[in-house]
C-alpha cells in the first residue's frame, strides 16, 4: 500500500492510473467504501462522502488515463486509505496528514518559550526534528520545546515530520519581540541634546501597548519614572512625564526621546519597558548616560565624568598636540596650574576616543573661556 | 455575452419523435458543457441530461435513457436533442442551459438558459 | 437519485418583509447547490451557485447559505419583482435533480 503524507491546510493529489491510455470509468472511495467522486464519461460526479466540497480531479489527464483525487484544504481526519477502482482493479492509497502549529502565537517576547506541537493521526508514529534560523537543532516527538528565546531565533523554523520512511517538511515563521539591542550608552559633554533610540528588532502590522522610562541617577538615592506613554498602532502618544528633566519623545516609531541638556543630576542608567497588548511580559532596554564636564577653578583644571563607565575606560587631560599630562582609570583627573593653551579632555576606551570636551586655558590674569 | 436560440414550437402526435436545436454563440463551443431541462405545464423543473460539446459524451437521466439522444454539430456551435416515442406527458417546455467547464470542479450549475421550446403531443 | 425537498411550498409576502426559504437534500452534496427565480413563461435565472456565491448581477438582498444537506436562501428585503418561483437544485452528481419549487406571491 503507497503511504502519502500530507500537511494540515495544504492540498494533496493522489494518483491512479490505468494501463489504457484513455478516459475510462473509475470512482474514489474512502475505507468505508464510500463514493468520494468519479466519473460519468468526461464528466465528473460526486458523492456523499465528508470530503464533497474538497475533493477534485484533473479531467485533462483522464484522456492519458490519469484519474488523481485531488483533496484541498486537508484535515487531520482526513488520514484514512482511499482506494481508486479503475479497470477491475483497485489501488490503495495511505493518507497521513499532520500539523505543525505553535504554542497560542508566533510572536513571542524575548526570553520566552517556544513550543511547537505536532498534530498526528491515530495509530502514527511521527518524529520530528526542527531547525532554528541560527542552525540550533532540536529533536521530539508529539511536542517540541524551545526556552529562553533569543533574538537570533526570529524567522523561519523549518520543522521535518518522518512517519513509514516518508517525510513532510513545516515551515513556521517566529517573530521574537525585542529591542535590536539589551542596552546602550550615550555619551555627552554637559549642556549637549541627548537623544535616546530604542529601535525594534521587529515590524508587525499594528503595534500597541503602553511603556514606561524609569531613571536611576547615579547621584539619587532611588529610581524615579521619567516618561509614560502609549503606543496605538504605532502612534506614540505621551501620558506623563517628569517636569525635571522635561523629557520630549517623537511620536512615530523607532521610540525616540530628548533630554534637552546633558547635565551631572542626570548621568545614570534608566530602562525602557514596553507591554505590548495581548502579550504577557515585557520588552526591556537598557541605556545608559555619561556626563563630562571640564572646568578650571583658581589654578586647578579639572576633568569630570559621570554615569555608569567600566573600569577599563581611560580619562586623560591633555594640551592640544602634546602628551597626556595626566591619564588615569578613574572618574576624575586634574593638573594644578596648567599652561595657557586648548586643553582637551578626553574618555577613551583601548585608544578609542568615547567622549571629549575642550577647554581654553588663557594666561593667568584672565579667565577661562569654555567653547 | 453567452447566448442560446432554441428552435420553435412543435406539435406531435403520440409514437412520434421530436428534434429540439438549441444553438450557441458568445464563446467557445466546446467550452460549456449543455443541460437539457423540462418543465411540464404547471410543474417543476427536469434535468434529461447533459452532453459535453467538446468529445460529444453524454449522461442521460435514466428516466429518459432509450428514448432521449443528445448530439452536437461543432461547425454550428449546435446541440441538438431527440425525444422519441413521445406520450402525452411529454408535453412541456425543453430548455437548453449552460455550465461553463473547468479543469476542475466547478459543479453543474446552470448559469445561461434558452428561452425555451414548446412541445405539445396531442392525438 | 438525490432527492430534493423544499419549504414552504408557497408563502405571502409583503415587499420589505425578509423571506427565507429552506432546501434541503436526502444526502450531502457538499456545497454544490444553486438557487434559482423563475417567473411565469420565462426561463430560470441562476440566483446563487456553490451554496452562497452570488451570480454576477443578481442584487445582494439575496443571499444563501449552508453545506451538507441543509441549504437556505434568503431575501432581506423582498422587492416588486421578487414575486417568483424559487427553486433549489443539487449540482453535485447525475442525475442532478431539482427541489419542487417554493412560490413567493403577494400577501
Known amino acids: 500500500k503507497k503511504v502519502v503524507l500530507g500537511k494540515k491546510g495544504d492540498t494533496v493529489e493522489l494518483t491512479c492510473t490505468a494501463s489504457q491510455k484513455k478516459s475510462i470509468q473509475f470512482h474514489w472511495k474512502n475505507s468505508n467504501q464510500i463514493k468520494i467522486l468519479g466519473n460519468q464519461g468526461s464528466f465528473l460526479t460526486k458523492g456523499p462522502s465528508k470530503l464533497n466540497d474538497r475533493a477534485d480531479s484533473r479531467r485533462s489527464l483522464w484522456d492519458q488515463g490519469n484519474f488523481p483525487l485531488i483533496i484541498k484544504n486537508l484535515k487531520i481526519e482526513d488520514s484514512d486509505t482511499y482506494i481508486c477502482e479503475v479497470e477491475d482493479q483497485k489501488e490503495e492509497v495511505q493518507l497521513l496528514v499532520f500539523g505543525l502549529t505553535a504554542n497560542s502565537d508566533t510572536h513571542l517576547l524575548q526570553g520566552q518559550s517556544l513550543t511547537l506541537t505536532l498534530e498526528s493521526p491515530p495509530g502514527s508514529s511521527p518524529s520530528v526534528q526542527c531547525r532554528s534560523p541560527r542552525g540550533k537543532n532540536i529533536q521530539g516527538g508529539k511536542t517540541l520545546s524551545v526556552s529562553q528565546l533569543e533574538l537570533q531565533d526570529s524567522g523561519t523554523w523549518t520543522c521535518t515530520v518522518l512517519q513509514n520512511q516518508k517525510k513532510v517538511e513545516f515551515k513556521i515563521d517566529i517573530v521574537v519581540l525585542a529591542f535590536q539591542k539589551a542596552s546602550s550608552i550615550v555619551y555627552k559633554k554637559e549642556g549637549e541634546q541627548v537623544e535616546f533610540s530604542f529601535p525594534l528588532a521587529f515590524t508587525v502590522e499594528k503595534l500597541t501597548g503602553s511603556g514606561e522610562l524609569w531613571w536611576q541617577a547615579e547621584r539619587a538615592s532611588s529610581s524615579k519614572s521619567w516618561i509614560t506613554f502609549d503606543l496605538k498602532n504605532k502612534e506614540v502618544s505621551v501620558k506623563r512625564v517628569t517636569q525635571d528633566p522635561k523629557l520630549q519623545m517623537g511620536k512615530k516609531l523607532p521610540l525616540h526621546l530628548t533630554l534637552p541638556q546633558a547635565l551631572p543630576q542626570y548621568a545614570g542608567s534608566g530602562n525602557l519597558t514596553l507591554a505590548l497588548e495581548a502579550k504577557t511580559g515585557k520588552l526591556h532596554q537598557e541605556v545608559n548616560l555619561v556626563v563630562m564636564r571640564a572646568t578650571q577653578l583658581q589654578k586647578n583644571l579639572t576633568c569630570e565624568v559621570w554615569g555608569p563607565t567600566s573600569p577599563k575606560l581611560m580619562l586623560s587631560l591633555k594640551l592640544e598636540n602634546k602628551e597626556a599630562k595626566v591619564s588615569k582609570r578613574e572618574k576624575a583627573v586634574w593638573v594644578l596650574n596648567p599652561e595657557a593653551g586648548m586643553w582637551q579632555c578626553l574618555l577613551s576606551d583601548s585608544g578609542q576616543v568615547l567622549l571629549e570636551s575642550n577647554i581654553k586655558v588663557l594666561p593667568t590674569w584672565s579667565t577661562p573661556v569654555q567653547p | 455575452q453567452v447566448q442560446l436560440v432554441q428552435s420553435g414550437a412543435e406539435v406531435k402526435k403520440p409514437g412520434a419523435s421530436v428534434k429540439v436545436s438549441c444553438k450557441a454563440s458568445?464563446?467557445?463551443?466546446?467550452?460549456?458543457?449543455l443541460h437539457w431541462v423540462r418543465q411540464a405545464p404547471g410543474q417543476g423543473l427536469e434535468w434529461m441530461g447533459i452532453?459535453?460539446?467538446?468529445?460529444?459524451?453524454?449522461s442521460i437521466a435514466q428516466k429518459f435513457q432509450g428514448r432521449v439522444t443528445m448530439t452536437r454539430d461543432t461547425s454550428t456551435s449546435t446541440v441538438y436533442m431527440e425525444l422519441s416515442s413521445l406520450r402525452s406527458e411529454d408535453t412541456a417546455v425543453y430548455y437548453c442551459?449552460?455550465?461553463?467547464?473547468?479543469?476542475?470542479?466547478?459543479?453543474?450549475?446552470?448559469?445561461?438558459w434558452g428561452k425555451g421550446t414548446t412541445v405539445t403531443v396531442s392525438s | 437519485d438525490i432527492q430534493m425537498t423544499q419549504s414552504p411550498s408557497s408563502l405571502s409576502a409583503s415587499v420589505g418583509d425578509r423571506v427565507t426559504i429552506t432546501c434541503r437534500a436526502s444526502?450531502?452534496?457538499?456545497?454544490?447547490l444553486a438557487w434559482y427565480q423563475q417567473k411565469p413563461g420565462k426561463a430560470p435565472k441562476l440566483l446563487i451557485y456553490?451554496?452562497?456565491t452570488l451570480q454576477t448581477g443578481v442584487p445582494s438582498r439575496f443571499s444563501g447559505s449552508g453545506s451538507g444537506t441543509d441549504f437556505t436562501l434568503t431575501i432581506s428585503s423582498l422587492q416588486p419583482e421578487d414575486f417568483a418561483t424559487y427553486y433549489c437544485?443539487?449540482?453535485?452528481?447525475?442525475?442532478?435533480?431539482f427541489g419542487p419549487g417554493t412560490k413567493v406571491d403577494i400577501k
Open positions: 442551459a449552460t455550465t461553463a467547464y473547468y479543469d476542475f470542479w466547478s459543479g453543474y450549475s446552470m448559469d445561461v
Open positions: 458568445g464563446y467557445t463551443f466546446t467550452d460549456y458543457y
Open positions: 452532453i459535453d460539446p467538446s468529445g460529444g459524451s453524454t
Open positions: 444526502q450531502g452534496v457538499g456545497n454544490d
Open positions: 456553490a451554496a452562497s
Open positions: 437544485q443539487q449540482a453535485s452528481s447525475f442525475p442532478l435533480t
